[in-house]
Each structure stands twice: as structure tokens, then as C-alpha cells.
Interface confidence: low
């Protein structure tokens, strides 16, 4: 066959679907690889062909579109399963071609099983809610296109495996789940089960997402440098190890980049010749506020090093702060006999 632009196996789009549920999978060519859509391709006389490789097999084979009740079908650029079976797991390829043009991409499809509490190997999206922030909603995801707007599905929401009904601060409202005031106790997995009729059959769509309650922007503050501070003086003798921790608290801010760095005499440590190492550790509170600690370390400090300016800097979307460490050279204690001699000499 003639040359085909092969985009390979698109592992970035690892598609997971539940067993015994409908699944609609769009050919990734039009979404991520080509600059035109399916309608344009179809109008230009291009044909979309589907085939697959079963799990643990090498052989590419055509998809059987003649199964009872049209279990697998294709509609425009969508491959439909009504419903999926466990052994539908494999690598699927969609190929767009005519006599002069060919482009194809493969993607993995995994059909997964769930237990009665909706536990499964499915990777769950995370939805962040601000703590005590007023009414916030989550929406049952990825259900568009499964049924026409004329069909009114029934939607049941669960927290963990428990049906949400008469909860104190969580109210199901169709496709939405409203949190009247989000609390730490609302952390957990939430599942919507959408049930709809189609051609005399009833289908269920199960969608689970993780809710994580995070710090509210109302309470967000610029970075706070806990160390260095004015109460601690780093007093060292030449040859000793100098260790200065820079500990910074960052309020949770959605999509904020938190940064901590040291400067020595106004320069980044990489830009100076001192043998300095920086070790960083990060911890998070339950509402994802962050504490970053960068420990500046000079194994054998010199007199020169003890005269330098060591400044800890921090930056988030809320602002930038800096704090200098108090570093000084320890004055050696005078020997006792000398001190006495000086004393006598003064009288």
C-alpha cells in the first residue's frame, strides 16, 4: 500500500471506559493531529476507516460492525460501543484516506471493571472546591453526545458508595451537585450515575471524580517567610558548616506557581564561585497550602563567606517577599590568662 502518515500510538490519550456501559470515542486525528475537521474531510472525499489490535496480540484486524444490536458502530468520526465488553480492550486505529492521501493514529482503549462502590483502576479527574466559600457546583463529566436533548435521563449521585440524599450540605441538582459550604469532610470520590433509554434498552453512564477541598482565595495571603527571621543569628567560626533554612508558607492559590530562591550578595548561588548546596523540601496542609523549605549549606565557611548577604526570596501569584539572614563571624573567646593580664594592666 502507498505511504501513510502514521502518527503512531497516541499514549497521551489513554482512554478508559467502564465495562457494560456505552462509550463514544472520537477519532483523535481531527482533535489533535490534523488542521481540518471530519466534515471537511468527508466533503473532500476522504473515508474514515477503523481497525484494532486486541490486547496481547500483534495482528491488526477490522472492527466487526455487524454484531447483534449494533453493539459497535461508527457515526461520522465517532466509534460507538453500546455497550462495551471487557475484551474490547486493545489499541484502536482510525485511518483517513483516499487514493492520494492517508493519515492514521492509534490509541489505547482500556475497558475497566468497577465494584459496587465504584472502585476501579480508572484514573479520576480532581475537582477542587474552595473551603467555606459559598455555593459551589460540580458537574457530571463527559456525558455530552450520549443521548439527544429530548431524552431526560435520571441522575443519581453518590459519595463513595453512599447515595447522596438528605446530606447536610450537599444537594443533588440533576447533572450538578451543589456544595452549600464546602468542608474538609467533603473530600472524597463522588460518582454520578446517568440512566437513559435508547431503542428499548436502558443504559447507564458512571462518572467518578475526586473532590478536594482547598484553601479559599478569600483567605489567601502573599508568601510568609518564617525563616530566616530577626530572632535567629547564624554565628559561625571559619571552617564550620553554615546551614540556613528558608521556610516559606504559601496560601493555596489555583494555578499559582510558588517559588523560593536564595541570593548571595544579590546573585543566584549558581552564578557565584562559593561551594554552596541548596536542598528543598515541600509539605502541604490538608487544604493544599504549601510550606517550602530551602536549606542553604556551605560545608566549610570562610571569613569572606560570613561577610556576605544571604537573602531568601519567595514569590506566588499574591506577591513577592524577601528576608535577609543574620550571619556573622563568631568572635573567639579570649584565653583566660590573657584576659586577666589585660585586666591587671588596666589598673
Amino acid at each position: 500500500s502507498e505511504r501513510c502518515d502514521d502518527w503512531g500510538l497516541d499514549t497521551m490519550r489513554q482512554i478508559q471506559v467502564f465495562e457494560d456501559e456505552p462509550a463514544r470515542i472520537k477519532c483523535p486525528l481531527f482533535e489533535h493531529f490534523l488542521k481540518f475537521n471530519y466534515s471537511t474531510a468527508h466533503s473532500a472525499g476522504l473515508t474514515l476507516i477503523w481497525y484494532w489490535t486486541r490486547q496481547d496480540r500483534d495482528l491488526e484486524e477490522p472492527i466487526n460492525f455487524r454484531l447483534p444490536e449494533n453493539r459497535i458502530s461508527k457515526e461520522k468520526d465517532v466509534l460507538w460501543f453500546r455497550p462495551t465488553l471487557l475484551n474490547d480492550t486493545g489499541n484502536y486505529t482510525c485511518m483517513l484516506r483516499n487514493t492520494t492521501y492517508c493519515s492514521k493514529v492509534a490509541f489505547p482503549l482500556e475497558v475497566v471493571q468497577k465494584d459496587s462502590c465504584f472502585n476501579s483502576p480508572m484514573k479520576l479527574p480532581v475537582h477542587k472546591l474552595y473551603i467555606e466559600y459559598g455555593i459551589q457546583r460540580i458537574t457530571c463529566p463527559n456525558v455530552d453526545g450520549y443521548f439527544p436533548s429530548s431524552v431526560k435521563p435520571t441522575i443519581t449521585w453518590y459519595m463513595g458508595c453512599y447515595k447522596i440524599q438528605n446530606f447536610n450540605n450537599v444537594i443533588p441538582e440533576g447533572m450538578n451537585l451543589s456544595f452549600l459550604i464546602a468542608l474538609i469532610s467533603n473530600n472524597g470520590n463522588y460518582t454520578c450515575v446517568v440512566t437513559y433509554p435508547e431503542n428499548g434498552r436502558t443504559f447507564h453512564l458512571t462518572r467518578t471524580l475526586t473532590v478536594k477541598v482547598v484553601g479559599s482565595p478569600k483567605n489567601a495571603v502573599p508568601p510568609v517567610i518564617h525563616s530566616p527571621n530577626d530572632h535567629v543569628v547564624y554565628e559561625k567560626e571559619p571552617g564550620e558548616e553554615l546551614l540556613i533554612p528558608c521556610t516559606v508558607y504559601f496560601s493555596f492559590l489555583m494555578d499559582s506557581r510558588n517559588e523560593v530562591w536564595w541570593t548571595i550578595d544579590g546573585k543566584k548561588p549558581d552564578d557565584i564561585t562559593i561551594d554552596v548546596t541548596i536542598n528543598e523540601s515541600i509539605s502541604h496542609s490538608r487544604t493544599e497550602d504549601e510550606t517550602r523549605t530551602q536549606i542553604l549549606s556551605i560545608k566549610k565557611v570562610t571569613s569572606e563567606d560570613l561577610k556576605r548577604s544571604y537573602v531568601c526570596h519567595a514569590r506566588s501569584a499574591k506577591g513577592e517577599v524577601a528576608k535577609a539572614a543574620k550571619v556573622k563571624q563568631k568572635v573567639p573567646a579570649p584565653r583566660y590568662t590573657v584576659e586577666l593580664a589585660c585586666g591587671f594592666g588596666a589598673t
Epitope: S116, C117, E132, Y158, M159, G160, C161, Y162, K163, I164, Q165, N166, F167, N168, N169, I181, L183, I184, S185, N186, N187, G188, R286
Partner: antibody
Framework: EVQLEESGGRVVQPGTSLRLSCAVS????????MGWVRQAPGKGLEYVAV???????YDASWAKGRFTISKANSKNTLYLQMNSLRAEDTAVYFC?????????????WGQGTLVTVSS | ELVMTQSPSSLSASVGDRVTITCQAS??????LAWYQQKPGQAPKLLIY???TLASGVPSRFSGSGSGTDFTLTISSLQPEDFATYYC?????????????FGGGTKVVIK
């Protein structure tokens, strides 16, 4: 009149299994969540597990893998299967009804059944 | 895991006294709190749910208040039948919380 009556409690050896039952009369298990709560001699109340009106369940973290709550709506009976029993599981086990399908508060209780785990 | 801390663990009071029992949650639980009364050899009895709503058939001398982490059960005028142990309970159905749902109890004894 609504009644909950636990049964199945007895003296058992450590490491053995036991199934407790709670016969429910006067209400439909389809419409209420149900729970098991235990109380060790002279101690406070401790949640064991809860099952929703439509059969989904939660259990306390310490009970995971050992204790399983279930129900038979047709028999209007709640069960607690207890495996690998330990001396510290000795307690009176109460079955209780949730005020609704998932309110969390328990408005109706049985009189309890005593489980003693001893060698 | 959520911890519910009740205080005091016991108290002595006389008939007619105003009695206050407190319950503290280790984190914010909104109004997800219930109070129970238990007498020796009996099953617990639901007194209050939703932190402040009186359960059916419970005398009005019992009242509940609070939200978030701090809750109070008040008996405005203690009656002879009120000498019992009282428990608070977090009513949230979070898998992590069921094991820590009840407070340790407060025993109300006759002075």
C-alpha cells in the same frame, strides 16, 4: 410498630467468624439506611458499618476486610459478617435505623446482641 | 481520622439544674452532629440531629447548638429520668469518619 431485633451473638474463639442478623419489622428496608454500632463492656459507642437504602455500604476503617454489612430486602433483614474475630471485638452489637436514606443520625435501635471473643 | 472530643467525661448535678455538655470535632463538620442519650442496659436514643433539631418525642428541655467544630447539648432543667450517658456523633458519611463518629460520652450522675 417498628422493631429491630438482633440475633447471632455468642461466645466464640479468636480467629473464628460469626454472622449477626437484625430482623426489621414495620418498615421497608428499601427506604432507609441501616447501621451497626458496637459498645465494648463499660465503654462508649463505636460505629462499625452502614448500608444505604439501595445497598451501598461504608465501614469503619478499622473494620475493613474483616467486617461486612449486607442486607436482604426480601427478608427485611440486616446482616453483619465478622471474620478473624479478636478479643477486642467483644461488645454488644446494636443494629440501628438511619432517620432517612442517608442522614447519618440513627433514630431507632435494637436492644443489642452480645458477642464475646475468648479462648 | 476525625476525632470527636466530649467534655466533661462525667458530671454531678441535681434535679432542676441546668446542664451543659460540649463536643468538639477535630475539624469543621458544619451542622453534621447528633446527640444521643443512653441509660444502663438500654440502647441509645436519638435526642438531636442537625446540631439543633429536636428528634420526635424528645422533651423541649433538651436543646443543641453550635456548628463547625464546637457543639453544645443543654438540659435546661434536669429531671430524674435524665440521669444517663450522653454521646455526640458526627453524621457525615465520609468513609474516613465513620470510625471516629462518636464522642467518648458524658455520664450525668446524681449529686
Amino acid at each position: 410498630e417498628v422493631q429491630l431485633e438482633e440475633s447471632g451473638g455468642r461466645v466464640v474463639q479468636p480467629g473464628t467468624s460469626l454472622r449477626l442478623s437484625c430482623a426489621v419489622s414495620g418498615i421497608d428496608l428499601d427506604n432507609y439506611a441501616m447501621g451497626w454500632v458496637r459498645q465494648a463492656p463499660g465503654k462508649g459507642l463505636e460505629y462499625v458499618a452502614v448500608i444505604s437504602s439501595d445497598g451501598f455500604f461504608y465501614d469503619a476503617s478499622w473494620a475493613k476486610g474483616r467486617f461486612t454489612i449486607s442486607k436482604a430486602n426480601s427478608k427485611n433483614t440486616l446482616y453483619l459478617q465478622m471474620n478473624s474475630l479478636r478479643a477486642e471485638d467483644t461488645a454488644v452489637y446494636f443494629c440501628a435505623r438511619d432517620r432517612g436514606t442517608s442522614t447519618g443520625s440513627l433514630d431507632l435501635w435494637g436492644q443489642g446482641t452480645l458477642v464475646t471473643v475468648s479462648s | 481520622e476525625l476525632v470527636m472530643t466530649q467534655s466533661p467525661s462525667s458530671l454531678s448535678a441535681s434535679v432542676g439544674d441546668r446542664v451543659t455538655i460540649t463536643c468538639q470535632a477535630s475539624e469543621n463538620i458544619g451542622n453534621g452532629l447528633a446527640w444521643y442519650q443512653q441509660k444502663p442496659g438500654q440502647a441509645p436514643k436519638l435526642l438531636i440531629y442537625g446540631a439543633s433539631t429536636l428528634a420526635s418525642g424528645v422533651p423541649s428541655r433538651f436543646s443543641g447548638s453550635g456548628s463547625g467544630t464546637d457543639f453544645t447539648l443543654t438540659i435546661s432543667s434536669l429531671q430524674p429520668e435524665d440521669f444517663a450517658t450522653y454521646y455526640c456523633q458526627c453524621t457525615y458519611w465520609n468513609p474516613d469518619y465513620i470510625g471516629g463518629a462518636f464522642g467518648g460520652g458524658t455520664k450525668v450522675v446524681i449529686k
